[in-house]
Interface confidence: medium
């Protein structure tokens, strides 16, 4: 049920598993469900009563190159009447995902995997008040 | 990570492209820190669309352990605590990336793997379908 | 160093609820998950369940479903667990045990809590 | 949900004693299996985790094997500060569960 640490043995090899030196893990980078689609409510992000705008990250040494960020564009929530009540509060929504991150030593270059923590949208939310003593 | 030696007309023999395999490191950047304090939250609790989280198991999987959003309603809480059925509570979902075991069981190989979970809900105005 | 520190031993009526705590120390307490397990000489370990205080979620063995209900409190650092109806079934020892959530074993347990039903 | 039987339930042996103590799951868990030490009054402390592998700062006489549904925990030397109970849980998949334990008295 998980993935060990260096120098955890974890299953019991099967005959058919890939030599892989110590320390190392072989990662085949060609995606599983890589053509499923997102089918989330159209336009979510407009219609929300916290609302975000989206903005692509690029990075050409990171696996998947563009990642996609979410910022919420208010910091109150938008009423009935289509106006920010700052008596609520809108929040961002984040989510761990895993990265290969490719890094150049010299003339050698390596891989490794990274966790990123990306902003997926925004929830609207009482606030928390701190009464003064 | 692994360090692969390139070509020797390294300087300029930039390959743009990522293998389709590669070698890397088994410890992950960044496995534990709390990138985000506003991560470790109670806005499933506080939203006006409020979610319950489940737990989804996978031995096959890395992490295997992910935690799944269902939204508690179909409307949205009003000012009152009430819900109002003349909003919807709608799952905000993410494609993310996990590791698969490939082959099945093998220790230290692994494909990318996208899957689709739901972290959250946010509060939507509803689509009015107006019939001709 | 990582501790966790269970409150002291409780008796209570049946019928009534009782809430047990499990403070967390070394550590950021909302990266892992904290399970609550019960010991009884009859039954030995039974896990009830884990709540990751991170995203408040929360899943139960079936079993406990009704008698637990498990929460957290990132301000203190404490995870509880309330246990209602109470029965001379629920007399036990109940621990909670950290979850390395990456690593992915537990690592630490609390000293356990006593729990006594009678009337 | 997976049973996991552990064997003996009681051991009395002497200082200097080899000591094995099996468990065995109902259904395969892989290798998610770990071994705990409980002391008197103190908190149980995790030895071996992955079946096999020894925990921080735990003595090498204490070693796990197994793979599956077969498990064994072995001290090589066991010595007066080793008496306590011992117990095999698998988290392989929830709910997660615990062998009976093996109380471990030295004569």
């Known amino acids: 049920r998980k993935i060990p640490k260096v120098g955890h043995t974890f299953f019991q090899k099967p005959e058919s598993c890939p030599p892989v030196p110590g320390g190392s893990m072989k990662l085949d980078i060609g995606i599983i469900n890589e053509n499923q689609r997102v089918s989330m409510s159209r336009n979510i992000e407009s219609r929300s009563t916290s609302p975000w705008n989206y903005t692509v990250t690029w990075d050409p040494n990171r696996y998947p190159s563009e990642v996609v960020q979410a910022q919420c564009r208010n910091l109150g929530c938008i009423n009935a009447q289509g106006k920010e009540d700052i008596s609520m509060n809108s929040v961002p929504i984040q989510q761990e995902t895993l990265v290969v991150r490719r890094k150049h030593q010299g003339c050698s270059v390596s891989f490794q995997l990274e966790k990123v923590l990306v902003t997926v949208g925004c929830t609207c939310v009482t606030p928390v008040i701190h009464h003064v003593q | 990570g692994i360090t692969i030696p390139r070509n020797p007309g390294c300087p300029n023999s930039e390959d743009k492209n990522f293998p389709r395999t590669v070698m890397v490191n088994l410890n992950i950047h960044n496995r534990n820190t709390n990138t985000n304090p506003k991560r470790s939250s109670d806005y499933y609790n506080r939203s006006t669309s409020p979610w319950n989280l489940h737990r989804n198991e996978d031995p096959e999987r890395y992490p295997s352990v992910i935690w799944e959003a269902k939204c508690r309603h179909l409307g949205c809480i009003n000012a009152d605590g009430n819900v109002d059925y003349h909003m919807n509570s709608v799952p905000i979902q993410q494609e993310i990336l996990v590791l698969r075991r490939e082959p099945p069981h093998c220790p230290n190989s692994f494909r990318l793997e996208k899957i689709l979970v739901s972290v959250g809900c946010t509060c939507v105005t509803p689509i009015v379908h107006h019939v001709a | 160093q990582v501790q966790l520190q269970q409150s002291g031993a409780e008796l209570v009526r049946p019928g009534a609820s009782v809430k047990l705590s499990c403070k967390a120390s070394g550590y950021t307490f909302s990266d892992y998950e904290i399970h609550w397990v019960k010991q009884t000489p009859v039954h030995g370990l039974a896990w009830i369940g884990v709540i990751h205080p991170g995203n408040g979620g929360t899943a139960y063995n079936q079993k406990f479903k009704d008698k637990a209900t498990l929460t957290a409190d990132k301000s203190s650092s404490t995870a509880y667990m309330e246990l209602s109806s109470l029965t001379s079934e629920d007399s036990a020892v109940y621990y909670c045990e950290r979850f390395l959530t990456y690593e992915g074993y537990f690592d630490y347990w609390g000293q356990g809590t006593t729990l006594t039903v009678s009337s | 949900s997976i049973v996991m039987t552990q064997t003996p339930k009681f051991l009395l042996v002497s200082a200097g004693d080899r000591v094995t103590i099996t468990c065995k799951a109902s259904?395969?868990?892989?290798?998610?299996v770990a071994w705990y030490q409980h002391k008197p009054g103190q908190s149980p402390k995790l030895l071996i985790n992955?079946?096999?592998n020894r925990y921080t700062g735990v003595p090498d006489r204490f070693t796990g094997s197994g793979y599956g549904t077969d498990f064994t925990f072995t001290i090589s030397t066991v010595q007066a500060e080793d008496l306590a109970i011992y117990f095999c849980q698998q988290d392989y998949g929830s709910p997660y569960t615990f062998g009976g334990g093996t109380k471990l008295e030295i004569k």
């Open positions: 992955y079946a096999s």
């Open positions: 259904q395969s868990v892989n290798n998610d």
